[in-house]
């Protein structure tokens, strides 16, 4: 029968080594064996590349493209094939559908004035144009309440989100991810980080214990529990 | 060492053919695009073709378009142009020269980075 | 296509002197920051060419550090600080981004 494509493809990049574009068929495809995703910069002497699809549902395929650092200029011609038959033929220019890296290394470590440092890393080198356009987005959940959640902006430059122990419940358990976005490109949101989880050790004030000794244990406390959630 | 030497160069009638042929060493040819530029006695320098490393890509001035073809065999390490339909204008010094890197998603740029010594094409009844 | 225009089509200058050729193009040929593709050539009669600039500033090998490229967008210019005896020849500017490529006139530089 004849191969038809239901969704054509839509395609995002990470501005600095990868372009992934995913599509639907109309019915359940071997994607790697039947189409071939070619694409060749739209640049004097260019030549024209091939992407071997893979599977990520039954009539889902993805083709993931190696590309050079992107520029503003670069468009992509994309042609999708099914043998000798042209199923799909389109245009795509990275820096109009960026998608950033997700965040790397997310931690969570006890600080002073009694808060919880939160700090991942930036997924782009110093050089990249990305590095310094991310802004991000931090989830902080309860992992036993799902209606106890909050979510902070970060607009600054840093990494990094402090958060005040007297916000989260005392002896609950939460977990954070991060995920990030580039304005100026008005991209779309990264995936979210793996998440990392961390017990919230936090007495009130009238219990009048010294929350610095608090602090100091939960210290170890964390150590041990965060030891145990990366090894299990 | 790079070195590239252009032969085939003659004294053709008009309306005839010639096919010009530019050997390469000293470097790996099938990475880099190839370019054809000339120069008529007492003139500058005009650019002809280019064809990309593979060979899958090919430029034309509109001077030549549809009488010259630009073609290449990575296994000799030649580069090719064949010239149809000549006229008198066409006389001049043709150079073959090394042009961008297309091993790369988007090529590497140095200019014409190595040129050949050039050979003649004279046409003339 | 594009012209490329290169003043002046003549220069002399003198031994240690400063030249300076400029070239303008119809179209620009900043593809994007840091690339700007234009080249510098010069050529001594009865040789072939040679690459000098190329991406608008950047030396090709084996050239000396008296000559350098400056410009962005559609004008460029070539610099030879300290002119020499064997500077002397014709200087093509080129433009590598859009097809069909194109050379400049030609700048016949004399030393007095």
């Known amino acids: 029968g004849s191969v038809k494509v239901l969704h054509e493809p839509s395609c995002f990049s990470d501005y600095i080594s990868t372009s992934v574009c995913q599509w639907k068929m109309d019915h359940p495809t071997n994607c790697s064996a039947e189409l071939r995703l070619s694409y060749q910069l739209d640049f004097m002497g260019s030549e024209n590349h091939t992407c071997v699809p893979e599977n990520r549902e039954d009539s889902v395929c993805v083709c993931s493209m190696p590309i050079d650092d992107a520029v503003e200029a670069d468009v992509y011609q994309l042609d999708l094939w099914a043998g000798q038959q042209l199923l799909w033929s389109g245009s795509f220019q990275p820096s109009k559908h960026v998608k950033p890296r997700t965040p790397g290394n997310l931690t969570v470590h006890p600080n002073i004035s009694h808060t919880w440092l939160l700090m991942w890393t930036n997924p782009y080198p110093t050089e990249n144009h990305l590095h310094s356009e991310l802004t991000y987005m931090v989830n902080v959940s309860n992992d036993n309440d799902p209606e106890d959640f909050k979510v902070y902006n970060v607009t600054y430059m840093g990494p990094t989100l402090r958060l005040a122990a007297s916000t989260l419940k005392s002896g609950a358990s939460y977990s954070a991810r991060v995920r990030a976005w580039a304005q100026t490109y008005n991209s779309t949101w990264s995936d979210w980080s793996p998440s990392t989880t961390w017990l919230n050790y936090y007495e009130p004030w009238e219990q009048h214990l010294g929350l610095n000794d608090i602090f100091e244990a939960q210290k170890i406390e964390w150590h041990e529990h965060h030891h145990h959630h990366h090894h299990h | 060492e790079v070195q590239l030497v252009e032969s085939g160069g003659d004294l053709v009638k008009p309306g005839g053919s010639l096919r010009l042929s530019c050997v390469a060493s000293g470097f790996t040819f099938r990475d880099y695009a190839m370019t054809w530029v000339r120069q008529a006695p007492g003139k500058g320098l005009q650019w002809l073709s280019l064809?990309?490393?593979?060979?899958?890509?090919?430029y034309y001035a509109d001077a030549v378009k549809g009488r010259f073809t630009i073609s290449r065999d990575n296994a000799k390490n030649t580069l090719y142009l064949q010239m149809n339909s000549l006229r008198a204008e066409d006389t001049a010094v043709y150079y073959c020269?090394?042009?961008?890197?297309?091993?790369?998603?988007?090529?590497?740029?140095?200019?014409?980075?190595?040129w050949g010594q050039g050979t003649l094409v004279t046409v003339s009844s | 296509d594009i012209v490329m225009t290169q003043t002046p089509l003549s220069l002399s200058v003198s031994p240690g002197e400063t030249a300076s050729i400029s070239c303008r193009s119809s179209k620009s040929l900043t593809y994007s920051i840091g690339y700007n593709y234009l080249d510098w050539y010069m050529q001594k009669p009865g040789q072939s060419p040679q690459g000098l600039i190329y991406?608008?500033?950047k030396r090709a090998s084996g050239v000396s550090d008296r000559f350098s490229g400056s410009g962005s967008g559609a004008d460029f210019t070539l610099k030879i600080s300290r002119v020499e005896a064997d500077d002397a020849g014709v200087y093509y500017c080129m433009q590598g981004l859009h097809s069909p490529l194109g050379f400049g006139q030609g700048t016949k530089l004399e030393i007095k």
């Open positions: 020269a090394v042009d961008r890197l297309t091993k790369t998603i988007r090529p590497q740029y140095y200019g014409l980075w190595h």
């Open positions: 991406l608008g500033s």
């Open positions: 064809i990309s490393g593979s060979g899958g890509k090919t």
